[in-house]
């Protein structure tokens, strides 16, 4: 069954945590649907963003942070492991120094920590996708 | 009650026709939600687009056409009559020489015809909005 989109969930992250998302683009890649995953510092959607991950399917991925309301230096990748019309599984792992983004089991993107992952309080998944799975796994202490 | 998004409806347009859309952005303007309305030449979403109208709420509007699979010269406007968090009523009227876009009763954008409006067979409304009304009115002959 489908999860609502935008999908928002409270989350606490630290090294070892992984966020897993399963979904499907709502349009063909020719029409450039988007997927966005934002790690927020508060439960409010206007809050700062520790890690912003935006896919323009078929074109590019941009990653960034939003600090005190201002977007910082954007990181762009043309790597496009997503398949037109196909379901995807996205996992974002918190490594000691960066986020590692896997797409369908394949390491696809990294983003160096600018803000501590411990500052994350909420994850939002949204834009032009249907969502079937959202999970945050925590490293067993 | 809400209409599904993406929302797709068969439509025949000519001078005097008006497409009316009521909806609301799904996110605050800080997060740059989008609204897109596309007038397609076929019932298929991969088909050419006679009139492409995309709002990046709080930032800008772009208009274009997609002909034989290729995007043409983009027209951009910084005019932003949409209100953060507020419902909007959008009406697109087919004039003899152009499309006229009204936002909340105020003439806000125009786009000269590149392809005859009679080539339109389908209208799609999508991206980051909830949709409460979609109507195509035809001029009585």
């Amino acid at each position: 069954s489908l999860l609502p989109v935008p999908y928002t969930e409270a989350a606490s992250l630290s090294t070892g945590s992984t966020v897993t998302i399963k979904g499907r683009p709502l349009a063909c890649f020719l029409n450039e649907p988007y997927l966005q995953v934002d790690f927020h510092t508060e439960m409010k959607e206007e809050s700062d963003i520790v890690f912003h991950f935006q896919v323009c399917f078929g074109r590019r991925v941009v990653m960034n942070s939003r600090e005190y309301g201002a977007w910082k230096q954007q990181v762009e990748s043309k790597n496009m492991p997503f398949q037109d019309g196909q379901e995807f599984e996205l996992s974002i792992s918190v490594l000691p120094d960066k986020y590692q983004v896997m797409v369908n089991g394949q390491s696809s993107y990294t983003f160096d920590h600018r803000i501590k992952p411990e500052a994350v309080k909420m994850v939002q998944v949204w834009r032009d996708i249907s969502l079937t799975k959202f999970n945050v796994s925590y490293l067993k202490r | 009650s809400l209409l599904p998004v993406p929302y797709t409806e068969a439509a025949s347009l000519s001078t005097g026709s008006t497409v009316t859309i009521k909806g609301r952005p799904l996110a605050c303007f800080l997060n740059e939600p989008y609204l897109q309305v596309d007038f397609h030449t076929e019932m298929k979403e991969e088909s050419d687009i006679v009139f492409h109208f995309q709002v990046c709420f709080g930032r800008r509007v772009v208009m274009n056409s997609r002909e034989y699979g290729a995007w043409k010269q983009q027209v951009e406007s910084k005019n932003m009559p949409f209100q953060d968090g507020q419902e909007f009523e959008l009406s697109i009227s087919v004039l003899p020489d152009k499309y006229q876009v009204m936002v909340n009763g105020q003439s806000s954008y125009t786009f000269d015809h590149r392809i005859k409006p009679e080539a339109v067979k389908m209208v799609q409304v999508w991206r980051d909005i909830s949709l409460t009304k979609f109507n195509v009115s035809y001029l009585k002959r």
Partner: antibody, heavy 124, light 107 residues
Framework: ELQLVESGGGLVQPGGSLRLSCAAS????????MSWVRQAPGKGLEWVSN????????GYADSVKGRFTISRDNAKNTLYLQMNSLKPEDMAVYYC?????????????????WGKGTLVTVSS | QAVLTQPSAVSVSLGQTARITCQGG??????ASWYQQKPGQAPVLVIY???ERPSGIPERFSGSSSGDTATLTISGAQAEDEADYYC??????????FGGGTHLTGL
């Protein structure tokens, strides 16, 4: 061996201008963000400005905004700081520094290599 | 005026543990870096991302942070560790700010 060598310092009158240069060698200069940090005589370190690897994005401390301009020439492996409307309080040793690992400035990783500095004296 | 507050001096005996604090930063959000500066020399990065050591920095240097305070710890301080130490964090990730500096003495 990685080296950063600053030059262009000297004596200038208040209201005057100076252009500092930092010649980089021993690493792929065009891949790293760079920064200018200054230290007034007997005082602590003060961040002045930074620039991303391509030169398209810059940042400035409030104390120098509108007066100083950072730039770089990746073909010449050189970082610059154009200083205008100099004030007595701008008098300091100016260091150029390389960010540890990213092409954009990221304070999380610090600055891992510094030049020896060049002294700017502002006096009438 | 430094936004990050450090003690102006910390005294430690040879072989003992020195702790230098840095207060006033948003260390719940931003990481701390630490620099060592000896007279007439350029600063040297000794800790970044709160607790990471660059290659070539002795293991006796360690770092931590909690709340509004970051701490540099030198376990078994050596004579060559006598120097000024500066903490650095971010007003934002791309905007560095330094503490006022701490002189480590007694060695």
């Amino acid at each position: 061996e990685l080296q950063l060598v600053e030059s262009g310092g000297g004596l200038v009158q208040p209201g005057g201008s100076l252009r500092l240069s930092c010649a980089a060698s021993g690493f792929t200069f065009s891949s790293y963000a760079m920064s200018w940090v200054r230290q007034a005589p007997g005082k602590g370190l003060e961040w002045v400005s930074n620039i991303n690897s391509g030169g398209g994005s810059t940042g400035y401390a409030d104390s120098v905004k509108g007066r100083f301009t950072i730039s770089r020439d990746n073909a010449k492996n050189t970082l610059y700081l154009q200083m205008n409307s100099l004030k007595p309080e701008d008098m300091a040793v100016y260091y150029c520094a390389k960010y540890l690992r990213t092409y954009y400035p990221n304070a999380a990783f610090g600055m891992d290599y510094w030049g020896k500095g060049t002294l700017v004296t502002v006096s009438s | 005026q430094a936004v990050l507050t450090q003690p102006s001096a910390v005294s430690v005996s040879l072989g003992q543990t020195a702790r230098i604090t840095c207060q006033g930063g948003n260390f719940g959000r931003y990481y701390a870096s630490w620099y060592q500066q000896k007279p007439g020399q350029a600063p040297v990065l000794v800790i970044y991302r709160d607790s990471e050591r660059p290659s070539g920095i002795p293991e006796r240097f360690s770092g931590s942070s909690s709340g509004d305070t970051a701490t540099l710890t030198i376990s078994g301080a050596q004579a060559e560790d006598e120097a000024d130490y500066y903490c650095q964090s971010g007003r934002s990730s791309d905007n560095a700010v330094f503490g006022g500096g701490t002189h480590l003495t007694g060695l």
